[in-house]
Amino acid sequence: MVPEEEPQDREKGLWWFQLKVWSMAVVSILLLSVCFTVSSVVPHNFMYSKTVKRLSKLREYQQYHPSLTCVMEGKDIEDWSCCPTPWTSFQSSCYFISTGMQSWTKSQKNCSVMGADLVVINTREEQDFIIQNLKRNSSYFLGLSDPGGRRHWQWVDQTPYNENVTFWHSGEPNNLDERCAIINFRSSEEWGWNDIHCHVPQKSICKMKKIYI
Amino acid sequence: LGEPQLCYILDAILFLYGIVLTLLYCRLKIQVRKAAITSYEKSDGVYTGLSTRNQETYETLKHEKPPQ
Amino acid sequence: LGEPQLCYILDAILFLYGIVLTLLYCRLKIQVRKAAITSYEKSDGVYTGLSTRNQETYETLKHEKPPQ
């Protein structure tokens, strides 16, 4: 016969067992709580820091863009792409048609004050979008120039000049003294580029990357 | 509802489910142990009761004939 | 890690925890049920075994002396 366990020993064993089980339960719940807290607090901190970042980003832009128009990018609530309110958006850029008549250098400076550059046209689709907002009887500076007058055209943002993606009017460029490019309308060829003197005041088109907040 | 909000709602549901199930599991485990002890006492020693194997995360109920 | 990614990871952890605990709980419950039946058979009717009260979400192990 196995010696019988005393009732108090059994009670003690049960008590220890209960303690162990409830300890496990508490630890499990604590771990769950930690996880849950992390998922709630961290995102809030994340959101908070993101909001702070957003606000500072907005403050950065506020000096020259008092209001932004933002749209949600994709499904993610946090990714907003914004353009300054009077600007138009296309793909990942914002565009602004400046109706003030200024020289090429002044136009570029004017764009850069707004955090932009004179427009760099990379595709036919982009040009097609831009011309929708232009007036046929006006000319607009592009971010394209040949300061040396040696036909080494260069874009203001250092994008390589690709001869295959240019939209010059026929016979243009045609003058080594005309070192800045405009986009204008010719009834025979519709919209295209022309070289003109940089000091001649023209309207202009500014382009900037969308602001992601 | 946006995707992230949905995720947090699911988090809360799973969290509550986890807590409730943890409590139920622990309660059941203790009841099993208590029942085993009660069973031992009431059967006047005919059976040794439930044997506990601590190395397992769960408990197996096992009746053995005591050595005669 | 981004905010949503963190939420999805936590979802996965809670989901796995819920599944594991559900399985353990069910297993324990089945073992309790089996043990009750075994206990009843082995005691040659001395005890009625475990009585189940279906209205409860959990099961209470209870030995009752059969009516004499």
């Epitope: 020289s103 570029q108 045609n174 003058n175 003294d177 070192r179 003197h197 000091h199 | - | -």
Partner: antibody, heavy 121, light 111 residues
């Protein structure tokens, strides 16, 4: 040798007209933008008008806009300035100057000797 | 219009000394590395003559004692050493944008 010779100046009554000419030689006239610059007695230099090499662009300051017209005849290597509705303040020595482009701007590398215009009653 | 302000209005220098003339623009006449200010010399009864273009480039045939410097809004013409034949009026000019404008001139006299 580059040479620019102005002519056509003289005395004219207020409201009158004059046509100044500038004969260019020693360079390919049709390849250069040209300007007229004036200097009132004892004063500084004041730009009056510009014409591009291909005749596609002309420009004037507000002080002469609508009254003065710049033109060129590349076949004759000549630059002209038609001045109408002349005023006393138009009295000055008028220089024709050749433009040289430098980066985004230009300067005047050669100047003629000038022709004097006097507007007086 | 861009206003160019020259100083001093007149300057008397001994031969062999340095003469410094400044020209201040009402706004920048530089673009990146291009400084679009030019300097002319005009002797009495003669047309202006180009000395310096692009702020610091010496026109061919101009003596090396003439030099130019500056960027954005502040530019300087230096004559060192001054010679008797340098008696003249000196003008700065910008044409980064139309209308091209000239400074009021600085009269340099040799003592």
């Amino acid at each position: 040798e580059v040479q620019l010779v102005e002519s056509g100046g003289g005395l004219v009554k207020p409201g009158g007209s004059l046509r100044l000419s500038c004969a260019a030689s020693g360079f390919t006239f049709s390849s250069y933008g040209m300007s007229w610059v004036r200097q009132a007695p004892g004063k500084g230099l004041e730009w009056v008008s510009t014409i591009s090499s291909g005749d596609s662009y002309t420009y004037y300051p507000d002080s002469v806009k609508g009254r003065f017209t710049i033109s060129r005849d590349n076949a004759k290597n000549s630059l002209y300035l038609q001045m109408n509705s002349l005023r006393a303040e138009d009295t000055a020595v008028y220089y024709c100057a050749r433009q040289i482009y430098y980066d985004y701007a230009y300067y005047f590398d050669f100047w003629g000797q000038g022709t004097t215009v006097t507007v007086s009653s | 219009d861009i206003v160019l302000t020259q100083s001093p209005a007149s300057l008397a220098v001994s031969p062999g000394q340095r003469a410094t003339i400044t020209c201040r623009a009402s706004e920048s006449v530089s673009f990146r590395t291009s400084h679009l200010m030019h300097w002319y010399q005009q002797k009495p009864g003669q047309p202006p003559k180009l000395l310096i273009y692009g702020a610091s480039n010496l026109e061919s045939g101009v003596p090396a004692r003439f030099s130019g410097s500056g960027s954005e809004t502040d530019f300087t013409l230096t004559i060192n050493p001054v010679e008797a034949e340098d008696t003249a009026n000196y003008f700065c000019q910008q044409s980064i944008e139309d209308p091209p404008t000239f400074g009021g001139g600085t009269k340099v006299e040799i003592k």
